[in-house]
Amino acid sequence: AWELTILHTNDVHSRLEQTSEDSSKCVNASRCMGGVARLFTKVQQIRRAEPNVLLLDAGDQYQGTIWFTVYKGAEVAHFMNALRYDAMALGNHEFDNGVEGLIEPLLKEAKFPILSANIKAKGPLASQISGLYLPYKVLPVGDEVVGIVGYTSKETPFLSNPGTNLVFEDEITALQPEVDKLKTLNVNKIIALGHSGFEMDKLIAQKVRGVDVVVGGHSNTFLYTGNPPSKEVPAGKYPFIVTSDDGRKVPVVQAYAFGKYLGYLKIEFDERGNVISSHGNPILLNSSIPEDPSIKADINKWRIKLDNYSTQELGKTIVYLDGSSQSCRFRECNMGNLICDAMINNNLRHTDEMFWNHVSMCILNGGGIRSPIDERNNGTITWENLAAVLPFGGTFDLVQLKGSTLKKAFEHSVHRYGQSTGEFLQVGGIHVVYDLSRKPGDRVVKLDVLCTKCRVPSYDPLKMDEVYKVILPNFLANGGDGFQMIKDELLRHDSGDQDINVVSTYISKMKVIYPAVEGRIKFSTGSH
């Protein structure tokens, strides 16, 4: 028998520095977690103790903090090289700055293979990107070889900016021939490493003949066997065992997100490459694990540029940006409108001639807007200003919801109106009218939504049974501020870009902004 240790991360999202327990900015260092310096300490400890170790990343290193905003992926290549990752799969967020923003900083600089079997380049891009990412890679591990096949969410064109010269194929259809090729080359230990979410990971384990282990990402799934060490609630045991269609037991793993945990899976193979046993657990990277001094020093060196960036002007406002709780928790506020407009703008994807865009709606809890921005400072808007407005380090995500769920969300928005509570919704691509004289749960008297399958966008009444795409903060997607109906009833959830980054990019693009209060949210009394 031969034993392999798989160390894995996924959805790190720019958390190069240690973070607080909820993966936001580290405040009290003695209670902080994760970060590449701490990760390196643990990885090195395991490499010294065990003979056959692979360090893998299942995608979405890009996007999430000011590190990515400033360094645009160069930081990912640099620190992943320093940690000596063995392989990485492409995630949807790796395309956030377009194909060029992937090729130059990451693909050309990485000293490890970057993988995806279901992304096919065409046209002029095919020769430019050839060999920079691969469908599979065979790695020597000790005296054996291990094949790693990559995959990426086929929804990437709706979630990021891969352009028109990359085709995202069905994962299972694309993986099978690559695994078959590895088998013909006498590779009998094969890991599928990819970024399509836990449901697809399980399907790959079930359907792709010859895959021995699946290491996934995208859904931020936390798996754990025994008593979990922090706040995350396990979605199942680690590893999650899937019985394949040909009768094999295939371990499937994922390691939550944000570099908080290091996935740790031990696999025992027989001489023919069959999995005999698998066991492990994610390792919580808490403060009991010291940060590696040399990596930490490097982080501090790179950090200097971030501090300079946060005080530079992104653009100007010629109006007061009202982000006060007195406005945003009670009525339409222009800061809410600005943020929602930025959220929609960030999700412009012309992937179908029938649709002007795939999504037109935004909702945003007023309690998430934490500060106004005064225009009387020469109109200057900086990253620092935006960090005061959006201090929680969240993301603006894409969900699919039924009209009936949206109706419940808007009822919840005003169910206890007047108490300055955070659940009051700011909107984009939505016209809502409330009648506060009616009883809670029956206060939405008009709800019109902007069409997407149209050449001239216009507002139509919400249909209860129709499925709509909506951009919203991850806080709401996870049921925050009492929006349990969103969490319980959402049909799909894809994590998006860092909130501040979305707004800062929009302001930089617009150069001068002047958001108004324009009647998106109205109040009425009497009959309708």
Epitope: P113, L134, K137, V138, P140, G142, D143, V145, L185, N186, V187, E271
Partner: antibody
Framework: QVQLVESGGGVAQPGRSLSLSCAAS????????MHWVRQAPGKGLEWVAL????????YYADSVKGRFSISRDNSKNTLYLQMNSLRAEDTAVYYC????????????WGQGTLVTVSS | KIVMTQSPATLSLSPGERATLSCRAS??????LAWYQQKPGQAPRLLIY???NRATGIPARFSGSGSGTDFTLTISSLEPEDFAVYYC?????????FGPGTKVDIK
């Protein structure tokens, strides 16, 4: 059928350099690791170097480490051996060899090219 | 570094006889052992890999056995074309070493 044809052998002075090439045909070159193995006149076989199918990993015998460099061009189906700081003991027939299965079998051998290091 | 030894250095036999060649490694090489045949003026030819698997086109009279440190190549009945030098070869951590060879000549 698999064919491996070495070239570039000849006489070189000690301390000088020589470059060997191996043209491969009859198989998908980019799928296979490749080796150089040498045999001094009247002696046994000595492994020299291995390069991974895509050129990403290289391994060398201690006797040549730091002096010899193995490389490949998959677009040209060609394997190379750059030999620097040559010594008399590098005199040998150099064989280009296909790795048939991840180091467990060296399954196809070229006919070899003779390198003579002499002043 | 793993050192390979082969015995005997020379084996003198007649056609039709059984030949047993031995190869010993200075430390365990698991199953990563191969046997090659070389005739004068020719390149070596793969006979056996992974200690006991016959390469494509190799006659059934050639067989390999052993594991760990001790390995054997057996030629059940020598044919005239089998008189040659036989080398064993191991791989450990992607470093390869050959034994010094056993010469099988006609008695």
């Amino acid at each position: 059928q698999v064919q491996l044809v070495e070239s570039g052998g000849g006489v070189a002075q000690p301390g000088r350099s020589l470059s060997l090439s191996c043209a491969a045909s009859g198989f998908t070159f980019s799928d296979y690791g490749m080796h150089w193995v040498r045999q001094a006149p009247g002696k046994g076989l000595e492994w020299v170097a291995l390069i991974w199918y895509d050129g990403s990993f290289e391994y060398y015998a201690d006797s040549v480490k730091g002096r010899f460099s193995i490389s490949r061009d998959n677009s040209k189906n060609t394997l190379y051996l750059q030999m620097n700081s040559l010594r008399a003991e590098d005199t040998a027939v150099y064989y280009c060899v296909r790795d048939g299965q991840w180091g467990s079998r060296l399954d196809y051998w070229g006919q070899g090219t003779l390198v003579t290091v002499s002043s | 570094k793993i050192v390979m030894t082969q015995s005997p250095a020379t084996l003198s036999l007649s056609p039709g006889e059984r030949a047993t060649l031995s190869c010993r490694a200075s430390q365990s090489v698991s199953r990563y052992l191969a046997w090659y045949q070389q005739k004068p003026g020719q390149a070596p030819r793969l006979l056996i890999y992974d200690a006991s698997n016959r390469a494509t086109g190799i006659p059934a009279r050639f067989s390999g056995s052993g594991s760990g440190t001790d390995f054997t190549l057996t030629i059940s009945s020598l044919e005239p074309e089998d008189f040659a030098v036989y080398y064993c070869q191991q791989r450990s951590n992607w470093i390869f070493t050959f034994g010094p060879g056993t010469k099988v000549d006609i008695k």
